[in-house]
Amino acid sequence: SEVEYRAEVGQNAYLPCFYTPAAPGNLVPVCWGKGACPVFECGNVVLRTDERDVNYWTSRYWLNGDFRKGDVSLTIENVTLADSGIYCCRIQIPGIMNDEKFNLKLVIK
């Protein structure tokens, strides 16, 4: 079952997700999506990184931590009740079926 995180309407929500880069700056692609993780990738992507930088994001979603050190925790700005639900953080470690995926439940009150 998903780990649950809470936030209040109008505040920022924080959904933690971390990995350890093999070497400093040796990043792996990460996607965040609204909805549980599908078989591959993310559904309804809100943000993604590649091996170098954040290369896709939608308004109100950002990475507040140092993603170059593996902190890919998602911040959602000024949340509303519609932001409630499951979010997927998928860390796409290269190789054969190496992905790490995390489903996080956001509850807005």
Epitope: A36, P38, V39, F40, E41, P94
Partner: antibody, heavy 121, light 107 residues
């Protein structure tokens, strides 16, 4: 328009090898995940393997993971499936398919016409 | 592996009929279900993804619904070109799996 053209199928003996190719055109090949799906003689569809846009992440059906290798050459706009230690149960029509992923993962939105692989002694 | 049980396996209908095909997943798959149409001798063609979203160019007479474990594909008014085999697929967890197919035949 999007086109996917498989080749390389044929008749092979059990234990043999075969390499399938899928030539892609009409879209930016390096911006899509790609998959192989097969259809058995009884018309059942079975996912075989998927590769990420860069080739860095790879996924296999358990029954083929030690025998098949999916790969891609983005410079040549071509997807491959190297098959070895073939068994009679690998007999099928093999399709390559495109998987959009960037803003929303969607499985197999375009398919090729397929190439037939027959494993028989 | 998640088993997708499709019913019926065969369906006879007439032009203009409304038909519904059902797919049941052996485990929860959220809305990660797609539907495909396959005409004889042709490759599968995508119709629906995310349980209810039509692919570009798919006629509005095709609709999908459901979430969790039960899903349906409805064709509101059958056209001659709709007589084909239909497959559902789940893409919630690995391996991606397909239903056994529903062959829609002209009555």
């Amino acid at each position: 328009q999007v086109q996917l053209q498989e080749s390389g199928g044929g008749l092979v003996k059990p234990g043999g090898s075969l390499k399938l190719s899928c030539a892609a055109s009409g879209f930016t090949f390096s911006s899509y995940y790609m998959s192989w799906v097969r259809q058995t003689p009884d018309k059942r569809l079975e996912w075989v393997a998927t590769i990420s846009n860069s080739g860095g992440s790879i996924y296999y059906l358990d029954s083929v993971k030690d025998r098949f290798t999916i790969s891609r050459d983005n410079a040549k706009n071509t997807l491959y499936l190297q098959m070895s230690s073939l068994k009679s149960e690998d007999t099928a029509m093999y399709y390559c398919a495109r998987d959009p992923y960037y803003s929303n993962y969607v499985p197999m939105d375009y398919w090729g016409q397929g190439t037939m692989v027959t494993v028989s002694s | 592996d998640i088993v997708m049980t499709q019913s019926p396996s065969f369906l006879s209908a007439s032009v203009g009929d409304r038909v519904t095909i059902t797919c049941k997943a052996s485990q929860y798959v959220d809305t990660y279900v797609a539907w495909y149409q396959q005409r004889p001798g042709k490759a599968p063609k995508p119709l629906i993804y995310s349980a209810s979203t039509r692919h570009t160019g798919v006629p509005s007479r095709f609709s999908g619904s459901g979430s969790g474990t039960e899903f349906t594909l409805t064709i509101s008014s059958l056209q001659p070109e709709d007589f084909a085999t239909y497959f559902c697929a789940q893409y919630s967890s690995s391996p991606l799996t397909f239903g056994g197919g529903t062959k829609l035949e002209l009555k």
